[in-house]
């Protein structure tokens, strides 16, 4: 079930997912001057079974001006540098991202991809927060948010994070120490 709202905004903080639950959709967006190829996929979709999950469909962009065909290639480092995940200025995927059952990893870039990725999360998805550069994290609890469903309405839990203006940055989980895996989180309707 799709989460019909967005993860909370925390002042001076950004969020990202370590892995994406099955059902997550990623818009096939192209950078300015490019468009999706005709009859190309609108979305990539995280699908799979209990043992393996992967992204269905491939996003492909072509020049808006010409009709030439496109190929799937990884952008050069300078192109990659500008990209960001939805509402995140952080790097793409931590190298030690856990392989969670029923989850997909960050999809690889596609040629002429837009700079911002637009994900459509599903119930049970967890995202992690970190303070932006120049701000320090004061934790009152987990710096994470989970999409839950109650009475048919979806909502994200409030991350317990305050970012103060001191020159020390916090890291995403996995970039400092292992975290509890989100796979045990409830994805069914919360009891009313």
């Amino acid at each position: 079930e799709l989460c019909d709202d967005d993860p909370p905004e925390i002042p001076h903080a950004t969020f990202k997912a370590m892995a994406y639950k099955e059902g997550t959709m990623l818009n096939c967006e192209c950078k300015r001057g490019f468009r999706r190829i005709k009859s190309g996929s609108l979305y990539m979709l995280c699908t799979g079974n209990s043992s393996h999950s992967s992204w269905d469909n491939q996003c492909q962009c072509t020049s808006s001006a010409t009709r030439n065909t496109t190929k799937q290639v990884t952008p050069q480092p300078e192109e990659q540098k500008e990209r960001k995940t939805t509402e995140m200025q952080s790097p793409m995927q931590p190298v030690d991202q856990a392989s969670l059952p029923g989850h997909c990893r960050e999809p690889p870039p596609w040629e002429n991809e837009a700079t911002e990725r637009i994900y459509h999360f599903v119930v049970g998805q967890m995202v992690y927060y970190q303070c932006v550069q120049g701000y320090r994290a004061l934790h009152r609890g987990p710096a994470e948010s989970v999409c839950k469903m109650t009475h048919g309405k979806t909502r994200w839990t409030q991350p317990q994070l305050i970012c103060t203006g001191e020159m020390e940055t916090s890291q995403f989980p996995g970039e400092e120490k292992p975290q509890a895996s989100p796979e045990g989180r409830p994805e069914s309707e919360t009891s009313c």
Epitope: E1, K153, R155, E189
Partner: antibody, heavy 116, light 106 residues
Framework: QVQLVQSGAEVKKPGSSVKVSCKAS????????MHWVRQAPGQGLEWIGY????????EYNQKFKDKATITADESTNTAYMELSSLRSEDTAVYYC?????????WGQGTLVTVSS | DIQMTQSPSTLSASVGDRVTITCSAS?????MHWYQQKPGKAPKLLIY???NLASGVPARFSGSGSGTEFTLTISSLQPDDFATYYC?????????FGQGTKVEVK
């Protein structure tokens, strides 16, 4: 109490445009996405798309991508949907519905009739 | 897109009858939601997340199912229940509805 009040019925010529409004009250407008749904005469329901009022981000059903433009005005708690290049097939009742999951509140509907 | 196929399209029944409407999704979905619509009115949420009754909905309505097959049941049809019923999925975009089942007086 939550209310979604839509603008009145419209009769339009083919090729013209129309802008339907949906004024929300009784809840925090920016906390919920606003969806739009179409119902042609004697037909079923079709999802058009939604807007996140806070950021203005929209997501459309590809079928309506070139037909509908959804906007929102935070200052008046109003969502809008503009339909362009109208054709007789666009004759329908258009509903706004509060998102955040299932559509628990709906506008009363706006009948748009396209006729020469 | 996920296609939703409701059956039957029209159902003729009498007050007191047990009525069952089925909705089949072209792909597996998490939950099914059901709406009731009366002529000239906006749809009204009836059942959410497959089996939960919306606020104020009588207990004669029930929902069940999983995967691709879902059912809406009215245990004892009442005069107020003659209407059109729509199933709805919001597991993936675009969101889609069934074509509707009209419950009419026999």
């Amino acid at each position: 109490q939550v209310q979604l009040v839509q603008s009145g019925a419209e009769v339009k010529k083919p090729g013209s445009s129309v802008k339907v409004s949906c004024k929300a009250s009784g809840y925090t407008f920016t906390s919920y996405r606003m969806h739009w749904v179409r119902q042609a005469p004697g037909q079923g329901l079709e999802w058009i798309g939604y807007i996140r009022p806070k950021k203005g981000y929209t997501e459309y059903n590809q079928k309506f991508k070139d037909k509908a433009t959804i906007t929102a005005d935070e200052s008046t708690n109003t969502a809008y949907m503009e339909l362009s290049s109208l054709r007789s097939e666009d004759t329908a009742v258009y509903y706004c519905a509060r998102g955040g999951g299932v559509f628990d509140y709906w506008g009363q509907g706006t009948l748009v009739t396209v006729s020469s | 897109d996920i296609q939703m196929t409701q059956s039957p399209s029209t159902l003729s029944a009498s007050v007191g009858d047990r009525v069952t409407i089925t909705c089949s999704a072209s792909s597996s979905i998490s939950y099914m939601h059901w709406y009731q619509q009366k002529p000239g009115k906006a749809p009204k949420l009836l059942i959410y997340t497959t089996s939960n009754l919306a606020s104020g909905v009588p207990a004669r309505f029930s929902g069940s199912g999983s995967g691709t097959e879902f059912t809406l049941t009215i245990s004892s049809l009442q005069p107020d229940d003659f209407a059109t019923y729509y199933c709805h999925q919001r597991s993936t975009y675009p969101l889609t509805f069934g074509q509707g089942t009209k419950v009419e007086v026999k």
